[in-house]
Amino acid sequence: AVNGTSQFTCFYNSRANISCVWSQDGALQDTSCQVHAWPDRRRWNQTCELLPVSQASWACNLILGAPDSQKLTTVDIVTLRVLCREGVRWRVMAIQDFKPFENLRLMAPISLQVVHVETHRCNISWEISQASHYFERHLEFEARTLSPGHTWEEAPLLTLKQKQEWICLETLTPDTQYEFQVRVKPLQGEFTTWSPWSQPLAFRTKPAALGKDT
């Protein structure tokens, strides 16, 4: 639902992390709350403490194992509960049956680097982090370039509709400082969303050669 005054939203990074946000208007800031994960077909269960991120919003990460371990599959269902302390007992505040591969949000791409730069173009590569081998090549990317005098919000989005971990930026201005970001999304999952943007990569195009027509 989307019309309530509270929300319990979780995403799976496709490997060993479920990140959750619980928000509730008028909730007490000093209440101790946690998220409890009970998979339907695993021997483990996991808990994380919800920590405030804003006036009425809490977040936590369920660490299911080593970062690159495949802890859940497409057939898993994890019952997630928000529990808050009320005196001596814990009270369930929210509950959901979580289908991890329907609610994916990958880690931001990493290791951005300039492969080759010229006066008007720049070739950039990156890597995906902690992404499941289940996706094979079923990923897409969005990239954006920050030009001088503009904001990230104004930057046009470049869409790569396949698993392509590089891009060749064209029609750049010589001897100009730019920044570049990329994000990734699996094609799978009804409620899957884009990863966070990568850390920006700063680069400068080469100056135009003196006395030459560019």
Epitope: A1, V2, N3, G4, T5, S6, Q7, F8, T9, W22, S23, Q24, W38, D40, I77, T79, V82, V92, M93, A94, I95, Q96, D97, F98, K99, E102, N103, E190, F191
Partner: nanobody, 126 residues
Framework: QVQLVESGGELVQGGASLRLSCAAS????????MAWFRQAPEKEREFVAL????????LYADSVKGRFTISRDNARKMVYLQMNSLKPEDTAVYYC???????????????????WGQGTQVTVSS
Amino acid sequence: QVQLVESGGELVQGGASLRLSCAASGRTFSNANMAWFRQAPEKEREFVALITWSSGSTLYADSVKGRFTISRDNARKMVYLQMNSLKPEDTAVYYCAADGPPYSGTYYRYDTYDYWGQGTQVTVSS
């Protein structure tokens, strides 16, 4: 859209049992939260019980714990509320409700739920 239709409400004596049914149709969720609420005259709608569609996890209001049992039949898209040892204070209109995904959160608040049935009247006489 999701349609929810309740049935099974009637007039019974205190101590009797009753089973309410809720039939879901339309765009049903494969992993929704399904709940029963009730509303007595001049009172606010209150949470009774919840079941998660996929795993069958359940939650109950303290006032009905041990007397009421919520269950579901996934194949038939049905949710049931078995009510035993009924008391006069259980008299109310009983509503079936569905939430998510995405989930609003606090399951015992009626404004969490997007979809509601029209209700079925349960009257318990002393």
